[in-house]
């Protein structure tokens, strides 16, 4: 790879925990998306909260390591948890510059693979997503 991985960086107000330390923020001015150059991986992530028909970005940034899913060229989110009734957290990992800016599509809530109502679930090594 010729360059260090660069991802979109965003943390919604009120989000607990920060991934800012996983990279170096680029000085991009105000009108551009904030960008972060990853320190420990070549992998970006994104987290969206889907409530009814509205998806709201919660976090975007660098992963702390290269893991399964990081080889994806695009952000294809999968459901990860139910932080509250009627809302679902979707996360993606991907391995190209700024690939976490947008998702390609969100599966409809309740589609196969969506965690049940027994509370938040995380795949092994994905506890970072639960720090919301």
């Amino acid at each position: 790879p010729p360059n260090r991985r660069t991802c979109v960086f965003f943390e919604a107000p009120g989000v607990r925990g920060s991934t800012k330390t996983l990279g170096e923020l680029l000085d991009t001015g105000t009108e551009l998306p904030r960008a972060i150059r990853c320190l420990y991986s070549r992998c970006c992530f994104g987290i969206w909260n889907l409530t009814q028909d509205r998806a709201q970005v919660e976090m975007q940034g660098c992963r702390d390591s290269d893991e399964p899913g990081c080889e994806s060229l695009h952000c294809d989110p999968s459901p990860r948890a139910h932080p509250s009734p009627g809302s679902t957290l979707f996360t993606c990992s991907c391995g190209t510059d700024f690939c976490n800016a947008n998702y390609s599509h969100l599966p409809p809530p309740g589609s196969p693979g969506t965690p049940g109502s027994q509370g938040p679930q995380a795949a092994p090594g994905e506890s970072i997503w639960m720090a919301l």
């Epitope: 010729p2 360059n3 170096e24 551009l32 990853c38 420990y40 991986s41």
Partner: antibody, heavy 113, light 112 residues
């Protein structure tokens, strides 16, 4: 095939500005960083910075901060590098490159009173 | 800034003989993601630079296999197994691990 074609030579007076263009073809312009590198006469190469055309995010050499602006026009697959407050030691060949793998032919900028 | 120091600065070589260029960085070029962002460029007289090697040892497409790169940390080497006439020019190492990215001062390869 990948090609980067730069604008022609420029002669500028000290204090003026210059804007060099770099038209890309043969690849998806928005998928690669465009780097800018300069080379003073008989000297080595100096990295100036880079820009990601898809969103305009750029990363500069601090040495040029405040004097350089890098922009892109995705509709024409063209990158631009503007250098302001020119001095005689800005006389150099300015190169654009696609993430440093394919390079333009260079643009000679001469700063002279 | 990270200083890239090349040696020798001038390299006279006989055609068909091997050549070796050293590049030392003032800081380690191994990044936190495990990669080392070290590249080598060739600049023939009157031409634009051309990438030969990226990631220390990966040959760029179209580069003859007589060119090879090696090294780690702060010490890197570009080797040409058998020098040909078309190899004449200046060779630069380059690091993209630290900002600002920096080039070595160049090594001029000429035929004896």
């Amino acid at each position: 095939q990948v090609q980067l074609v730069q604008s022609g030579a420029e002669v500028k007076k000290p204090g003026a500005s210059v804007k060099v263009s770099c038209k890309a073809s043969g690849y998806t312009f928005t998928d690669y960083w465009v780097s800018w590198v300069r080379q003073a006469p008989g000297q080595g190469l100096e990295w100036m910075g880079e820009i990601y055309p898809k969103n305009g995010v750029s990363n500069f050499n601090e040495k040029f901060k405040g004097r350089v602006t890098m922009t892109t026009d995705t509709s024409t697959s063209t990158a631009y590098m503007e250098l302001r407050s020119l001095r005689s030691d800005d006389t150099a060949v300015y190169y654009c490159a696609r993430q440093r793998d394919y390079w333009g032919q260079g643009t000679l900028v001469t700063v002279s009173s | 800034d990270v200083v890239m120091t090349q040696s020798p600065l001038s390299l006279p070589v006989t055609l068909g003989q091997p050549a070796s260029i050293s590049c030392r960085s003032s800081q380690s070029l191994e990044y936190g993601d495990g990669y080392t962002y070290l590249e080598w460029f060739q600049q023939r007289p009157g031409q634009s630079p051309r990438r030969l090697i990226y990631g220390v040892s990966n040959r760029f497409s179209g580069v003859p296999d007589r060119f090879s790169g090696s090294g780690s940390g702060t010490d890197f080497t570009l080797k040409i197994s058998r020098v040909e006439a078309e190899d004449v020019g200046v060779y630069y190492c380059f690091q993209a691990t630290h900002d600002p990215n920096t080039f070595g001062q160049g090594t001029k390869l000429e035929i004896k």
